[in-house]
């Protein structure tokens, strides 16, 4: 698609521009900038208005149109998501006096749930003061190819559906897109509309293949045991309903009276052997999963389990 922005597990900068302002647009893929990584494996999108030093300021603008775009060095154009009403864009003439600072940021994280039915986007406000004072609403517009007819690559005007995002908890909105099983391999086109205090921010058109954005449920049944040869065997079960093999990341810490040791291993089996274990030590273990043979998103970590070895380990076991 040349009219939509492909979502990949990166962190993006989404810049929002009022009229007659010069802009520095930039894209921050993971690894190119400090603080771009995300410990739980999700990509993040930040929405940040950045103005030049000509004195343009939110509080000086009585009516402002905000165009929000992802920007890359290769593509200076921005595809705005078409409104279903007469094909207008979702950029509005708004009253922006409510903004006293130029600092409106959002983190956006999306994935397909492990049961392969719901595509979820979380939109978190990083501009806490504004959104405490002004309730904000988030809608997600999306389109999947029609089941009943051949669909062109670019959606026709008015073909989007809209979901009302649930913004009831922790200054974070949850948008749920139902994905029929038959469409898991199709391309989902979507855009976000964020409204607060009369100001509307509109993301560009984004595209994603849901099957490539699966976030599995955490692995199940994590347990530990000492093997006959004195190693610690960590085992777990794959979560249900995932239609492809997973890789697993196991992190564990060993806490004994003499040493604290931490380790992190990637495996494709549903078990891991830890050797050189110490008597009288405790091992805290967590595991998470991700698609093995293609793109995907790491699951949440499983609930931590703690295993304490006996003060004396017998070979062979008593």
């Amino acid at each position: 698609f040349n009219l939509s922005y492909p979502i990949t597990p990166w962190r993006f900068k989404l810049s929002c521009m009022p009229p007659n302002s010069t802009y520095d647009y930039f894209l921050l893929p993971a690894g190119l900038s400090k603080n771009t990584s995300n410990s739980n494996g999700h990509y993040e999108t930040a929405v940040e208005p950045k103005f030049n030093s000509s004195g343009t300021h939110f509080s000086n603008l009585s009516k402002t149109t905000f165009h929000c775009c992802f920007r890359s060095e290769q593509d200076r154009n921005c595809s705005l998501c078409a409104d279903n009403i007469e094909g207008k864009t979702f950029v509005s003439t708004v009253n922006s006096l409510v903004f006293q600072q130029i600092d409106a940021n959002w983190n956006i994280q999306c994935w397909l749930k492990g049961d392969l039915k719901l595509f979820i986007c979380y939109v978190e406000s990083l501009f806490k003061n504004l959104f405490r004072n002004y309730n904000y609403k988030v809608h997600l517009l999306y389109v999947l190819p029609e089941v009943l007819e051949d669909s062109p690559l670019v959606p026709q005007k008015g073909s989007f559906q809209m979901v009302h995002c649930n913004c009831s908890v922790h200054e974070c909105c949850e948008c749920l897109v139902p994905v029929p099983t038959a469409k898991l391999n199709d391309t989902l086109l979507m855009c976000l509309k964020i409204t607060s205090g009369g100001v509307i921010f509109q993301s560009p058109l984004m595209s994603v293949q849901p099957i490539n954005m699966v976030k599995p449920d955490p692995p199940l049944g994590l347990h530990m045991e000492i093997t006959d040869d004195g190693n610690l065997k960590i085992s777990w079960s794959s979560p249900p309903l995932v239609p492809f093999p997973l890789q697993y990341q196991v992190k564990y810490s060993e806490n004994s009276t003499t040493v604290i040791r931490e380790a992190d291993k990637i495996v494709s089996a549903t078990s891991l052997l830890v050797d050189s274990i110490l008597p009288g030590s405790s091992y805290e273990v967590q595991v998470r999963g991700k698609r093995l043979d293609g793109p995907g998103i790491w699951s949440d970590w499983s609930t931590p389990r703690v295993f304490t070895t006996q003060d004396v380990i017998y070979f062979p076991p008593k």
């Epitope: 279903n84 009403i85 007469e86 049961d115 039915k117 719901l118 089941v147 009943l148 008015g158 073909s159 989007f160 559906q161 809209m162 979901v163 009302h164 649930n166 749920l176 139902p178 029929p180 038959a182």
Partner: antibody
Amino acid sequence: QVQLVESGGGVVQPGKSLRLSCVASGFTFSSDAMYWVRQAPGKGLEWVAVIYYDGNYQYYEDSVKGRFTISRDNSQNTLDLQMNSLRVDDTAVYFCARLNWDYWYLDLWGRGTLVTVSS
Amino acid sequence: DIQMTQSPSSLSASVGDRVTITCRASQSISSYLNWYQQKPGKAPKLLIYAASSLQSGVPSRFSGSGSGTDFTLTISSLQPEDFATYYCQQSYSTPPITFGQGTRLEIK
């Protein structure tokens, strides 16, 4: 046989509570989102609440938010609607209905159960 | 929320007549419109989904058309069992779903 059967309706005073149930049979209940829809006497259809297939997501029509709770037990194939602080304008026939996930239409309905709120 | 307005509110017709019921949305809803039939004391029954797709088991005399804001349900040749109330429902803006106020089809 594919069907939905509601129960639990009756006459209740304003401010009181009532719990409606809907038993599903003949299809894989745990795979489907479910709606409660109501119809006041002589009036049209109005959605009340929806719960997604896994029970983790619920949404409510504005007038029932904070008073009604939709829930489900996939092991028992049951859908419930707990109605608290009932008002006279909640008087209606309440239908449970199965949602088609592809096009968001209601393709299977129960026969309904009548709730009358009256002093 | 999206408002759905049906017209007429009621209409009288005879067996064999061709009948058209219209439904208008307060904003464009593409083809995300469904039609239901309800008989007195019964639950609604799905007739048409996605504006023009006939639900399995529904007679072919029922058809739907339209896109955007204006939609029609047509019964090509009325049968005695077709006298009922008909509702449209938008599935564009979800999870709230909104119905039209209904069109009552009576025997002339």
